[in-house]
């Protein structure tokens, strides 16, 4: 594949990553492999910059994340390690919280009104942001 | 309820071309990527390609690049394919389908490529 | 492109067993997964995404299971209504693909 160089048509760059804002909601899996699609993958939040600029482009609607506890343990999907890693989870969350008797817990994470993080079930349907990274080889062949 | 509602059987002739539709109803249109799918007789399912209504965006199976043009009007809520150049191994039925996964499908359009 | 093996190509069956449909992929597409049944003269239908999510409307005897390059689809005790093709699909990456597909038939 070819290096990607600039951010693709209605993304946003910012700080060498490509940014997309969803206006639907879906599930946690349909907006995982929405991205994934897209050559991307939800939005690893890093830094407390990269925070504040995608809390400033969502404002205050829930939105999925690519943060997720699903086999265990909590994992972002680009691979970033989550204990080392930036954190700004709501006081007391992630809890894990059965009681919205939709049955199991709350596996998947999200940005709140405020920014903050939450875990809630993965079958609601959040807006969410894809991120790519400028200069990674993309997937899509060199146009000839 | 959503419902996708393509339109009728087509016989036409060698080397002519064909545009079929796919009106929808019942959910956001551009919210889902529509897919057009190809099963020959007593076949299996071949994915041709999907246009992303909020922007047009297309993508092809390789195979069917230069075969079939997807594309899509908004206002209708309908997607098209245009098949051209059509020989018999174009005879077939052409679903239309919803998102990456195929939640919903259309009935079928009944290709048949005849001289 | 990632190619979707199915096996058996046939399976005969008498209504009431449990029967087990595989989906092997080319290469991993972790739980990007989906089940179809296609009846006679009519549209697929989704039975069961992302590996083993179940879809409403579908009744609780179909299951899937698997993640990486082996899949599984289920039907945990089979009924006369189930006869007919199961295709599996990816959605790892483009382009999108089946399986050549498994027939379920009475034995």
């Known amino acids: 594949g070819s290096e990607r160089t600039c951010c693709p048509v209605n993304w946003v760059e910012h700080e060498r990553s490509c940014y997309w804002f969803s206006r639907s909601g879906k599930a946690w899996a349909d907006a995982d492999n929405y991205c994934r699609l897209e050559d991307a993958h939800l939005v690893v939040v890093t830094s407390w910059e990269e925070q504040k600029f995608v809390q400033h482009h969502i404002g205050p609607v829930n939105t999925w994340m690519g943060l997720h506890d699903q086999n265990g343990p909590w994992k972002w999907v680009d691979g970033t390690d989550y204990e080392t890693g930036f954190k700004n989870w709501r006081p007391e969350q992630p809890d894990d919280w059965y009681g919205h008797g939709l049955g199991g817990g709350e596996d998947c994470a999200h940005f709140t009104d405020d920014g903050r993080w939450n875990d809630d079930v993965c079958q609601r349907p959040y807006r969410w942001v894809c991120e790519t990274e400028l200069d990674k080889a993309s997937q899509e062949p060199p146009l000839l | 309820e959503v419902q996708l509602q393509q339109s009728g059987p087509e016989v036409v002739k060698p080397g002519a071309s064909v545009k079929m539709s796919c009106k929808t109803s019942g959910f956001t249109f551009t919210d889902y990527y529509m897919n057009w799918v190809k099963q020959g007789h007593g076949k299996s399912l071949e994915w041709i390609g999907r246009v992303n209504p909020s922007n047009d965006d297309t993508r092809y199976n390789q195979k069917f690049k230069g075969k079939a043009t997807l594309t899509v009007d908004k206002s209708l809520s309908t997607a098209y394919m245009q098949l051209n150049s059509l020989t018999s191994e174009d005879s077939a039925v052409y679903y239309c389908t919803r998102w990456f996964y195929f939640d919903y499908w259309g009935q079928g359009t009944t290709l048949t490529v005849s001289s | 492109d990632i190619v979707l093996t199915q096996s058996p190509a046939t399976l005969s069956v008498t209504p009431g067993d449990r029967v087990s449909l595989s989906c092997r992929a080319s290469q991993s597409i972790s739980n990007y997964l989906h089940w179809y049944q296609q009846k006679s003269h009519e549209s697929p239908r989704l039975l069961i995404k992302?590996?083993?999510q179940s879809i409403s409307g579908i009744p609780s005897r179909f299951s899937g299971s698997g993640s990486g390059t082996d899949f599984t689809l289920t039907i945990n005790s089979v009924e006369t209504e189930d006869f007919g093709m199961y295709f599996c699909?990816?959605?790892?990456?483009?382009?999108?693909?089946f399986g050549a597909g498994t027939k379920l038939e009475l034995k």
């Open positions: 992302f590996a083993s």
């Open positions: 699909q990816q959605s790892n990456s483009w382009p999108l693909t």
